[in-house]
């Protein structure tokens, strides 16, 4: 039968300068001999040939004295190649040939790895640095192979993949120089880091500048809000926060504050040239003026509408700006639900009734949820339906129509889903015949 | 409707300045705010910077120095002029905008206008 | 500055594909943050603001989620007419752009 000659599956990864076994087997049948064997080792792409043993004898390194076989395994099957002093120039894939009476051949890949250096970094320019200039910072990491991935992040771990320039050169022993070059504007301060990493060896190699110029005249704003929307009840006054980290020797005279719907841009409330310009909204809101120094920025609403629900933008600017939108979700509750029977007197288990139950004034619309007296939810046979009044509050009417039972207890909750608040009502229908409301 | 129409293309020298113009219609300056926004060739987006419906500027710190943003109102018209021009300057800039006082997104582009910066 | 992240940087896609790209900030900017498209030799074109918020008169097929620091622009079933490049902006602390998703046909 054929000859079957075993290599690994996955590359051999050698590091330069040092040893690699090219591993090769295969199963010598009963009785073999290295007489019989024919073993030859050669690059699979030029068919070079590199180690051979014929006629019961090592013939040899064809390839630069630096390979050998292991002799006394070769008896029982082991064909494997010694490559010592591995170079760059080594990599690719060699040919383990073996023939018997039969022949088989497989080729193993031979991967070159170096790792890198720890990279050095230089900043150009290196002093007098302000926020807002441009420093060229480079990261250089030597000798390594194969070529480079090079990562830049911030302090924050964040990725810097804008204005990077890397260079890899490779010295006459094949090995790479890494040179990887980041503009970058300067913030108020800031860490920058290089990663060089080897990708066949999985190793980092890290260093970092921190850089901390002097403080600039001009910062970005950065305007905080709640992120969750705040919920405020029709009638009441509602705040919508916003605040800025004022500079020293900052002044009302140098804010521009502007509120504004985010969708439609209409404006709500502004405070420029050092004066609030005041409310552009219904006259419903203000700002805290006292505040304002502070970087409170937040904005009052009066006698809150449902028509004011919504996103609303907080847009500061002092010399930079900065601008985040805050939601104003509208609530309001459900009153108590009331029920009604129809019919409502003379009623027999077996009958088909129709229980209504109606809650008033909530916002925004309700889930109606009815049960029976051992709280198994109805589903089936439910009509609901919720109009909206002028002031955009809805009145819920909700139809149950069910077959009675020799009594039963049959409950309505009115959920308002912003306010988590459940608003029930219940009718109980016992006896025969049966009355509603009972007769005293 | 809304529509920003820009000057026509510029090829300036390294050194040199360069004034594009962006005519606004359909709506007036001081309730829109214009951003002006580069391109360079097979690149991203860039802000340069913007005027207010107030009239205020803000400029990208890349650019302080260099860019000066004004507008005239009476014929609804910004400008945005860039000095010292260098190589890298070469791209496509275009005047963009919304309504409102607050810069933030933008809505309505002008065709764009490229300026070829070379020796 | 803050800091944007776009990726990936280009993705092939066939029409009625569900596509996703992703933005990611430096840091948290709320919900300040949009969304465009842009054909060669056209200017952008806004498709959504406020991290969510349609713009109108663009298809419905287009949404946006996220809040803080991630944020995705999904294209539910792509049209032909959508393989162009898409590109994110925050306004939460000055302007920046994304660096660019380049959706290509496969």
């Known amino acids: 039968g054929a000859l079957e000659v075993q290599v690994p599956e996955d590359p051999v990864v050698a590091l330069v300068g040092t040893d690699a076994t090219l591993c090769c087997s295969f199963s010598p049948e009963p009785g073999f001999s290295l007489a019989q064997l024919n073993l030859i080792w050669q690059l699979t792409d030029t068919k070079q040939l590199v180690h051979s043993f014929a006629e019961g004898q090592d013939q040899g390194s064809a390839y630069a004295n630096r390979t050998a076989l292991f002799p006394d395994l070769l008896a029982q099957g082991n064909a494997s190649l010694r490559l010592q002093r591995v170079r760059v120039a080594d990599e690719g894939s060699f040919t383990c040939f073996v023939s018997i009476r039969d022949f088989g051949s497989a080729a193993v890949s031979l991967q070159v790895a170096a790792p890198y250096s720890k990279p050095s970094m230089t900043l150009e320019p290196n002093k007098d640095l302000r926020p807002g200039d441009t420093v060229t910072i480079t990261c250089s990491s030597y000798q390594g192979y194969p070529e480079a991935e090079v990562f830049w992040q911030d302090g924050q771990g964040v990725p810097l993949t804008g204005n990077v320039t890397t260079s890899q050169m490779a010295n006459e022993q094949g090995l790479f120089d890494v040179h990887s070059i980041l503009r970058v504007v300067l913030g108020a301060n800031g860490t920058y880091s290089c990663l060089v990493r080897n990708p066949v060896l999985q190793q980092d190699a890290h260093s970092s500048v921190t850089i901390t110029p002097q403080r600039s005249p001009t910062g970005a704003v950065e305007v905080q809000v709640p992120e969750d929307p705040v919920v405020a009840l029709v009638g009441t006054d509602a705040t919508l926060r916003c605040s800025f980290s004022p500079e020293p020797g900052f002044s009302l005279a140098q804010l521009n504050l502007i509120w504004q719907l985010t969708d439609t841009k209409q404006l709500v409330h502004s405070f420029t040239e050092g004066r609030d310009q005041g409310s552009a909204y219904a006259n419903r809101t203000a700002l805290f003026p006292d505040l304002l120094a502070q970087g409170n920025a937040s904005l009052r609403l009066q006698r809150v509408r449902v028509a004011d629900e919504g996103s609303f933008t907080c847009f500061v600017s002092i010399r930079d700006f900065g601008s985040a939108a805050v939601s104003l979700q509208v609530a309001a509750p459900y009153s108590k639900p009331s029920m009604t029977l129809e019919p409502n007197k003379d009623l027999r288990p077996g009958d088909t009734v129709t229980i209504t139950c109606s809650s008033y004034r909530g916002y925004p619309e309700a889930e109606v949820f009815w049960q029976d007296g051992q709280g198994v939810p109805l589903t089936g046979n439910v009509t609901t339906s919720q109009m909206a009044n002028e002031q955009g509050l809805f009145d819920v009417h909700s139809v149950l129509r069910v077959v009675l039972g020799a009594n039963g207890t049959y409950s309505c909750l009115v959920r308002n889903p912003v306010l988590q608040q459940d608003a029930h009502g219940s009718v109980t229908i016992t006896g025969q015949p049966m009355t509603f409301p009972p007769e005293a | 409707q809304v529509q920003l129409v820009q000057s026509g293309a510029e090829v300036k020298k390294p050194g040199a300045s360069v004034k594009v113009s962006c005519k606004v219609s359909?709506?007036?300056?001081?309730?829109?705010?214009v951003s002006w926004v580069r391109q360079a060739p097979g690149q991203g987006l860039e802000w340069m910077g913007a005027?207010?419906?107030?009239?205020?500027?803000y400029y990208n710190s890349k650019f302080q120095g260099r860019v000066t943003m004004t507008r005239d109102t009476s014929t609804s018209t910004v400008y945005m002029e860039l000095s010292s021009l260098r190589s890298e300057d070469t791209a496509v800039y275009f005047c963009?905008?919304?309504?409102?006082?607050?810069?933030?997104?933008?809505?309505?582009w002008g065709q764009g206008t490229l300026v070829t910066v070379s020796s | 500055d803050i800091q944007m992240t776009q990726s990936p940087s280009s993705l092939s896609a066939s029409v009625g594909d569900r596509v996703t790209i992703t933005c990611r900030t430096s840091?948290?900017?709320?919900?300040?943050l949009a969304w465009y498209q842009q054909k060669p030799g056209k200017a952008p074109k806004l498709l959504i603001y406020n991290a969510h918020s349609l713009q109108t008169g663009i298809p419905s097929r287009f949404s946006g989620s996220g809040s803080g620091t991630d944020f995705t622009l999904t294209i539910s079933s792509l049209q032909p007419e959508d393989f162009a490049t898409y590109f994110c902006?925050?306004?939460?602390?000055?302007?920046?752009f994304g660096s660019g998703t380049k959706l290509e046909i496969k």
């Open positions: 840091q948290s900017i709320y919900k300040s």
């Open positions: 005027i207010s419906s107030g009239g205020s500027s």
């Open positions: 902006q925050q306004y939460y602390s000055g302007l920046t």
């Open positions: 359909g709506f007036s300056l001081t309730s829109y705010h």
């Open positions: 963009t905008g919304d309504l409102g006082a607050a810069i933030s997104w933008f809505a309505y």
